[in-house]
């Protein structure tokens, strides 16, 4: 058993049918010694008397808010949550496996640049009685500070007969050095509590591996005289690290016909312009990627050929 926060305790339970459970001793936070009784949740049934209460925690029915009273007055509360292990594996019921980039991916994180700011998100089908707490650091043995905000509900989607909820959190490394080579990974830890169930999820990454630039901005077409060719130009996204001479991007320019089946013409360039043939009803799209490290491509920025 360990304390999650004041008056909230997590009991780690290795569960299997007929498991003996965990013996837990609760102590009433009072100088009183006599006439103390204990109850669970809203029930008036007296579970025991005395300054301490010993319980055998075998299942969620044994968790909840234990209260000690004296003469009708509440003395203190202890909320017991369960962290359940089954077949040697901690439960992961609260969050949905996003399965990308691999199975058992519950947290996904992205950074728009090398400033040490990043966003993580996760999915759940649970709509109520749900709280999240996020902590982060660089390295784990001698951790350096990363400050995370509160997790917020960022999107709701309907998937079949299921509603899916996306939560996200923004974090900032306290003393980020954008140009430095990373040697220790960022660690992100999410505590999830649903009703009386506690679970924790972790992710470990280097900022360089989660970089995904914003799409190029100010995408423009300039027709070339007496030609079907156009000059496409764009700019680095505002959110990308500076100076651009050091934090350089490479770009992919794509000409796509109206039909998805039509052949795509693609050009790769380190410049912020390119000359392409603009077909009728086609569109031109440009995306960006870190020039020196193969992390994710940005989403496409697009303009119609006409």
């Amino acid at each position: 058993i360990w304390e999650l926060k004041k008056d909230v305790y997590v009991v780690e339970l290795d569960w299997y049918p007929d498991a003996p459970g965990e013996m837990v001793v609760l102590t009433c936070d009072t100088p009183e010694e006599d006439g103390i009784t204990w109850t669970l949740d809203q029930s008036s049934e007296v579970l025991g008397s005395g300054k301490t209460l010993t319980i055998q925690v075998k299942e969620f029915g044994d968790a909840g808010q234990y209260t000690c009273h004296k003469g009708g007055e509440v003395l203190s509360h202890s909320l017991l949550l369960l962290h359940k292990k089954e077949d040697g594996i901690w439960s992961t019921d609260i969050l949905k496996d996003q399965k990308e980039p691999k199975n058992k991916t519950f947290l996904r994180c992205e950074a728009k640049n090398y400033s040490g700011r990043f966003t993580c998100w996760w999915l759940t089908t649970i709509s109520t009685d749900l709280t999240f707490s996020v902590k982060s650091s660089r390295g784990s043995s001698d951790p350096q500070g990363v400050t995370c905000g509160a997790a917020t509900l960022s999107a709701e989607r309907v998937r079949g007969d299921n509603k899916e909820y996306e939560y996200s959190v923004e974090c900032q490394e306290d003393s980020a050095c954008p140009a430095a080579e990373e040697s220790l990974p960022i660690e992100v830890m999410v505590d999830a509590v649903h009703k009386l169930k506690y679970e924790n999820y972790t992710s470990s990454f280097f900022i360089r591996d989660i970089i995904k630039p914003d799409p190029p901005k100010n995408l423009q077409l300039k027709p070339l005289k007496n030609s079907r060719q156009v000059e496409v130009s764009w700019e680095y996204p505002d959110t990308w690290s500076t100076p651009h001479s050091y934090f350089s991007l490479t770009f992919c320019v794509q000409v796509q016909g109206k039909s998805k089946r039509e052949k795509k013409d693609r050009v790769f360039t380190d410049k912020t312009s390119a000359t392409v043939i603009c077909r009728k009803n086609a569109s031109i799209s440009v995306r960006a990627q870190d020039r020196y490290y193969s992390s994710s491509w940005s989403e496409w920025a697009s303009v119609p050929c006409s």
């Epitope: 299942e59 969620f60 019921d93 079949g160 007969d161 299921n162 009703k195």
Partner: nanobody
């Protein structure tokens, strides 16, 4: 919302068997742990057993262990309670319930309940 409808109750002799079904509709059935409870006249609702959302784990009250078996078919959105070696003290209204905490014998941990089906075991 999840709607639950129990069926399969009836009158049987002591020692006989009976299978109860609980059909769920509404939100995704496979997101819920399913439980069975029972209530005899003049008594509190009593936990019978529960099955995890994937059907891989079950948990039973001592009073029914070895006699009752819970199973589920997520493709059919149905949970079953197979009762054998029935005793007169098994007479009760049987309720199916859906929750999100497994295992739990506490009715507080179940969010949705059926209307119940009567089982009577005569001696």
């Amino acid at each position: 919302e999840v709607q639950l409808v129990e069926s399969g109750g009836g009158v049987v002799q002591a020692g006989e068997s009976l299978r109860l079904s609980c059909a769920a509709s509404g939100r995704s059935f496979s997101n819920y742990e399913m439980g069975w409870f029972r209530q005899a006249p003049g008594t509190e609702r009593e936990f019978v057993g529960t099955i995890s959302r994937r059907g891989s784990s079950t948990y039973y009250a001592d009073s029914v262990k070895g006699r009752f078996t819970i199973s589920r078919d997520n493709a059919k959105n149905t949970v079953y309670l197979q009762m054998s070696s029935l005793k007169p003290e098994d007479t009760a209204v049987y309720y199916c319930a859906a929750g999100q905490l497994f295992p739990s014998s506490h009715s507080r941990d179940y969010d949705y309940w059926g209307q119940g089906t009567q089982v009577t075991v005569s001696s």
